[in-house]
Interface confidence: low
């Protein structure tokens, strides 16, 4: 009932709670002397459904038959309207539309751990839209029964609070859930089970790992389990992997030997348990154990490359470079690299340990035959040394690769192609493609990159340490035994016109011509490989087109003569630089007047 209903009543037949699709009769009746003051037949009773008028009638009562009510709650309010006054609320009622409960489905019960309590879950089916009470019943041996009722709002779970024990693991228990509301009731199918069917062990705990003699090949995983556990499954994976390795073990009694772990790798381990071969369910996975396996001595060999530089008539500089071993080859933290330099004829040898670098530079005599060996060492040992004989890599002209080209290939890639050398191409054992940023002055501190290519390849895609708008000096070496030939080219992955022109720093007169000297454009403003310089000149205050001289770009060149200037004429000169993408803006302008005699 709504409010006190002092003035009248609203009655609902057959009930306030009805089945979806049913019809209800709603009657609103005034109590004696509660109508309009003067004429009772002026009483106008109005029935509202929520805020919408649905019926009215003059007199002391109003009957209304209502159909098509939706699921849920509908509020009806009866009001009285008298002449010249506001409507007065008489009374109201709520009608609750719902359905009888569906049969609960998929009833299943579980006891978490040997000391846990029995809890069951089920699917309620569709919402009844009415208060529905669920009763869960469990019957066991010796006519024992337990019952629990659900007062929760969304009831699809109940815990009996009782513990099944393993004294008679084959004894049968039967569970059933019954749903009841104002419109009907329904019971689930019974679910029959034994202790072994429903006990789900607690996940294993206290997981540890031991490596005997600090060796990855002798590894045992230990854990603790509940007393009745018969089966375990183990899963483990490197921490950076998504794929698990799985192992099933029976009667493990809390330990298992793992034979296929990789050295120096962080693994994640988890274990699950089960009480019976084919009854019951697996426990949840245990909490993860993370552990790093011990190191083993490195496998594989270092990729070593070198550069020779002439110092003077008796000495040369050797720079050795090598690449880090992969994680799977290093099998531990590389503590140092061991470099051994040996003169092969005299037998003199020098060994040095290098830490923190993957390069080493030394000066040796230009005479003699020299070899180097480089290996990587971790706490367990060293890799096999890589041995190379130091030779003049470009000495054999007939071994030089031909028609070397370098073309941009997408973002930050350069495709290098070549033709085999003229000399018997089958003599080539491998090609090495080497690249480094081009720096005027041939800076030896610039990092060196290289890759090796099989003898039947005539192209290589270089992408490591390639930046846009930077020019690279690229060399292709063909190696055959103790001989080598090479060819070089400049290349860039992306280019545009240089940002500035060369800066003319001096103009000097020499025997009727001039020599122009300039500063190189800063590398970061070259925007790729320079192809040409242009020198422009024109008479000062003249509107004529300037003359120009185009010079092919060479790294070391920074001066050029011009001999076509007239004496005693003042000229303005400037320079630009060109890449394949276009010409730079002007560099600085300089004025110059040749003092020589007129022709």
């Amino acid at each position: 009932k709504i409010d006190a209903c002092k003035r009248g009543d609203v009655t609902v037949k057959p009930s306030h709670v009805i089945l979806l699709g049913s019809t209800v009769n709603i009657t609103c009746s005034l109590k004696p002397r509660q109508g309009c003051f003067h004429y009772s037949r002026r009483n106008k009773l109005i029935l509202y459904k929520f805020d919408r008028r649905i019926n009215f009638h003059h007199g002391h009562s109003l009957n209304s038959q209502v159909t098509g009510l939706p699921l849920g709650t509908t509020l009806f309010v009866c009001k009285l309207a008298c002449i010249n006054s506001d409507e007065i609320q008489i009374c109201g009622a709520e009608i609750f539309v719902g359905v009888a409960p569906e049969q609960p489905q998929n009833l299943s019960c579980i006891q978490k751990g040997e000391q846990g309590t029995v809890a069951c879950t089920w699917e309620r089916g569709r919402d009844t839209h009415l208060y529905t009470e669920y009763t869960l019943q469990l019957s066991g041996p010796k006519n024992l029964t337990w019952q629990k009722q659900c007062k929760d709002i969304y009831c699809d779970y109940l815990d009996f609070g009782i513990n099944l024990t393993p004294e008679s693991p084959e004894s049968n228990f039967t569970a059933k859930v019954t749903a009841v509301n104002s419109l009907g009731s329904s019971s689930s199918l019974p679910s029959t089970f034994t202790f072994l069917d429903i006990v789900r062990p607690l996940p294993p705990w206290d997981i540890r790992i031991k490596f005997q003699k600090a060796s990855v090949s002798r590894c045992t995983l230990y854990w603790r389990d509940e007393g009745l556990v018969l089966l375990n499954r183990l899963r483990y994976r490197p921490s950076n992997s998504r794929l698990w390795n799985m192992v099933n073990v029976t009667k493990a009694k809390g330990r298992h030997d793992l034979l296929d772990l990789k050295p120096f790798t962080e693994y994640e381990f988890q274990i699950s348990s089960k009480l019976h071969l084919y009854k019951g369910s697996w426990s949840d996975w245990s909490e993860s154990l993370r552990a790093q396996t011990p190191e083993e001595e490195p496998t594989g060999m270092l990729d070593v490359w070198y550069m020779k530089r002439h110092i003077d008539y008796s000495r040369q500089q050797i720079s050795l470079f090598w690449k880090n071993l992969s994680v799977s080859e290093a099998r531990g933290k590389i503590l140092h690299y061991q470099v051994t330099l040996q003169e092969l004829t005299g037998g003199k040898a020098m060994t040095q340990n290098i830490t923190g670098h993957t390069s080493w530079t030394t000066v040796i005599p230009r005479t003699g035959n020299w070899a180097v060996a480089v290996s990587a060492a971790n706490s367990k040992g060293s890799s096999l040394p890589t041995r190379i004989n130091i030779m003049n890599l470009c000495e054999a002209g007939l071994l030089a690769p031909r028609q070397v080209s370098a073309n941009s290939e997408g973002m930050d890639n350069i495709l290098v192609t070549w033709q085999p050398p003229r000399k018997d191409p089958s003599a080539v054992q491998e090609y090495v493609v080497e690249w480094r940023e081009l720096h005027p002055g041939g800076d030896t501190q610039v990092p060196l990159n290289w890759l090796r290519s099989r003898p039947y390849n005539v192209s290589a895609l270089i992408s490591e340490n390639i930046k846009s708008y930077i020019c690279y000096e690229i060399r292709v070496y063909a190696l055959s035994g103790d001989q080598g030939g090479c060819s070089s080219i400049l290349g860039n992955s992306k280019h545009k016109a240089p940002l500035s022109g060369p800066h003319i720093n001096a103009i000097t007169e020499e025997k009727g011509s001039i020599l122009i000297s300039w500063n190189s454009i800063p590398v970061q403003e070259q925007m790729g490989c320079l192809l040409h310089y242009r020198i422009y000149w024109k008479e000062r205050d003249s509107n004529s087109q300037p003359q120009l001289c185009e010079i092919p770009y060479r790294v070391s060149q920074n001066s050029h003569p011009i001999n076509s200037l007239q004496p005693r004429v003042t000229y303005v000169l400037w320079m630009t630089a060109l890449t394949a993408a276009g010409e730079s803006s002007h560099g600085n302008e300089r004025e110059f007047c040749l003092q020589g005699k007129a022709n």
């Epitope: 709650t73 719902g98 208060y131 529905t132 007062k151 929760d152 709002i153 009831c155 509301n181």
Partner: nanobody
């Protein structure tokens, strides 16, 4: 017209407690359910706890069972959510919602036509 007004949110350290209040007005019968929902940015609303005005039947989400407690004061038309042992993952905007019902089933947000404006709860050290 049904109106819901929340209060009691704020900043609290992990392990601390807060009590949220929801003032309810405008219902014409005792057949209604009040529910607390919470929402974090980028996530759907999650039902936390509910109570029925008539008989006081309650519901709690698994994530808050044993830590949160819902209660009602029929005389004052108030519903309270007592939150204990708060964790950083409880940080959210908490909103109370209501609907007419004789049934406690269905806790989906779309089934609740009436909503408050929400109150921010932040659990942080």
């Amino acid at each position: 017209e049904v109106q819901l007004v929340e209060s009691g949110g704020g900043l609290v350290q992990p392990g601390g407690s807060l009590r949220l209040s929801c003032a309810v007005s405008g219902f014409t019968s005792d057949y209604y359910v009040i529910a607390w929902f919470r929402q974090t940015p980028g996530h759907e609303r999650e039902g936390v706890s509910s109570i029925r005005k008539g008989d006081g039947a309650t519901y709690y989400a698994d994530s808050v069972k044993g830590r949160f407690s819902i209660s009602r004061d029929n005389a004052k038309n108030m519903v309270y959510l007592q939150m204990n042992s708060l964790k950083p993952e409880d940080t959210a905007v908490y909103t109370c919602a209501a609907r007419y019902d004789t049934l406690l089933g269905g806790g989906r947000p779309r089934e609740f036509p009436y909503w408050g404006q929400g109150t921010q709860v932040t659990v942080s050290s």
